[in-house]
């Protein structure tokens, strides 16, 4: 797994709604696959971690300054939707196709 | 100045381009305010730092499991332009007004 | 090598029209904004006109002295600008120059050519 | 319309020695954190000739004893050591709106 001196990656992270107390609204499925950004943007950033002009600037600031700047940090910059089944206001279990936001599809350092 | 303790903010970081070595093609400004995102994304996630649910799930997670996944992180979510006056492949000083994404203009929990 | 070749000017008589030309080299001419600039006998220098580029729609801008009388122009193609001054003055004698540049600077600069008004 | 004034209109400085032209603009002429101010020296029967612009940068070739500083409405053109071939007119021009402007000019000359 990605640790702290790893560069910027998407790894796993099974979340269980049970866990987060969202079982309570969420019948199925009972876990997913989140994924997790993970590990460090570190100079020279890579074309992969997709990094905007101003997370070139702070990396840069970081090199010649580090303990007065951060460094830019590994998120998620896409994320993909997942398909719940849920119990709606009359408590009718609904299939949401789209629940977006829910899964990492992309990670990238910002 | 927003900390490690502070929530996640926007706070100042005036950037020299001597500094980040692109002053050999930024002629002006000399430095610009690139502003940077610090601070923690605690739970409850406020409206304001404009949590995506994949970052909600992911404080969630972390507040069961921290030492197995970390905080959602404090990062630009919206970048503004600045003007600069650099040299083209001719050496002819040249205004680019909208130079994208070099300066935060919002900050947020990803 | 960077030229800015302004054509032949002359004696004109009040009222009159002229056409300047400048052909342009050593740079690509469509990269660029082009400009007159003129000087009268023992004076300042005085911006006439400018065209930006095919981007900006060929937008063209005119000193105040000249606007409605004077049209610029460009052809890309021809690596040329031009300048058409109607209704001439005796006040728009002077040499005129061909420049080059971006939207900052006057960069490139033609060796002028001179326009006498007179009757 | 921004308006450039020059001063001295004319200037005798000694070779070797320091010549300093003003250029007062009638606004400022800085904007985005960057000087629209530009100077020109033209010589007899040329052309003028890009020497400093953004207010203190020197042109292509331009030689090291012409230096030029200021922001905001005040901008000065120093040429050290005054040689021979400095002789010439100087003007200040201004980019920051259309019409681009320049100021009247300064005549310089060896004393």
């Known amino acids: 797994s990605a640790g702290a001196g790893s560069h910027c990656q998407k790894t796993s992270l099974r979340v269980n709604f049970e866990d987060i107390g969202w079982d309570s609204w969420i019948i199925a499925p009972k876990e997913y696959e989140a994924y997790e950004c993970k590990g460090g943007c570190f100079f020279p950033l890579a074309d992969d971690v997709t990094p905007t002009k101003h997370a070139i600037v702070q990396t840069l600031v970081h090199l010649k300054f580090p303990t007065k700047v951060g460094k830019a940090c590994c998120v998620p910059t896409k994320l993909s939707p997942i398909s719940v089944l849920y119990k709606d206001d009359m408590g009718v279990p609904t299939l949401k196709y789209h629940y977006e936001g829910m899964s990492v599809a992309e990670c990238g350092c910002r | 100045s927003a900390g490690a303790g502070s929530h996640c903010q926007k706070t100042s970081l005036r950037v020299n381009f001597e500094d980040i070595g692109w002053d050999s093609w930024i002629i002006a400004p000399k430095e610009y305010e690139a502003y940077e995102c610090k601070g923690g994304c605690f739970f409850p996630l406020a409206d304001d730092v404009t949590p995506t649910k994949h970052a909600i799930v992911q404080t969630l997670v972390h507040l069961k499991f921290p030492t197995k996944v970390g905080k959602a992180c404090c990062v630009p979510t919206k970048l503004s332009p600045i003007s600069v006056l650099y040299k083209d492949d001719m050496g002819v000083p040249t205004l680019k007004y909208h130079y994208e994404g070099m300066s935060v203009a919002e900050c947020g929990c990803r | 090598e960077v030229q800015l070749v302004e054509s032949r000017g002359g004696l004109v008589q009040p009222g009159g029209s002229m056409r300047l030309s400048c052909a342009a080299s050593?740079?690509?001419?469509?990269?660029?904004?082009m400009n007159w600039v003129r000087q009268a006998p023992g004076k300042g220098l005085e911006w006439v006109a400018h065209?930006?580029?095919?981007?900006?729609?060929?937008?063209?801008h005119y000193a105040e002295s000249v606007r409605g009388r004077f049209t610029i122009s460009r052809d890309d193609s021809k690596s040329s600008v031009y300048l058409q001054m109607n209704s001439l003055k005796t006040e728009d004698t002077g040499i005129y120059y061909c420049?080059?540049?971006?939207?900052?600077?006057?960069?490139?600069w033609g060796q002028g050519t001179l326009v006498t008004v007179s009757s | 319309d921004i308006v450039l004034t020059q001063s001295p209109d004319s200037l005798a400085v000694s070779l070797g020695e320091r010549a300093t032209i003003n250029c007062r603009a009638s606004?400022?002429?800085?904007?985005?954190?960057?000087?629209?101010m530009n100077w020109f020296q033209q010589k007899p029967g040329q052309p003028p000739k890009l020497l400093i612009y953004a207010a203190s940068n020197q042109g292509s070739g331009v030689p090291d004893r012409f230096s030029g500083s200021g922001s905001g409405t005040d901008f000065t053109l120093t040429i050290s050591p005054m040689q021979a071939e400095d002789v010439a007119m100087y003007f200040c021009?201004?980019?920051?709106?259309?019409?681009?402007?320049f100021g009247q000019g300064t005549k310089l000359e060896i004393k």
């Open positions: 065209i930006r580029l095919k981007s900006d729609n060929y937008a063209t």
């Open positions: 050593g740079f690509t001419f469509s990269n660029y904004w």
């Open positions: 021009q201004q980019s920051k709106e259309v019409p681009w402007t």
């Open positions: 606004e400022s002429v800085d904007n985005y954190g960057i000087s629209f």
């Open positions: 420049t080059g540049g971006s939207n900052y600077v006057f960069a490139f």
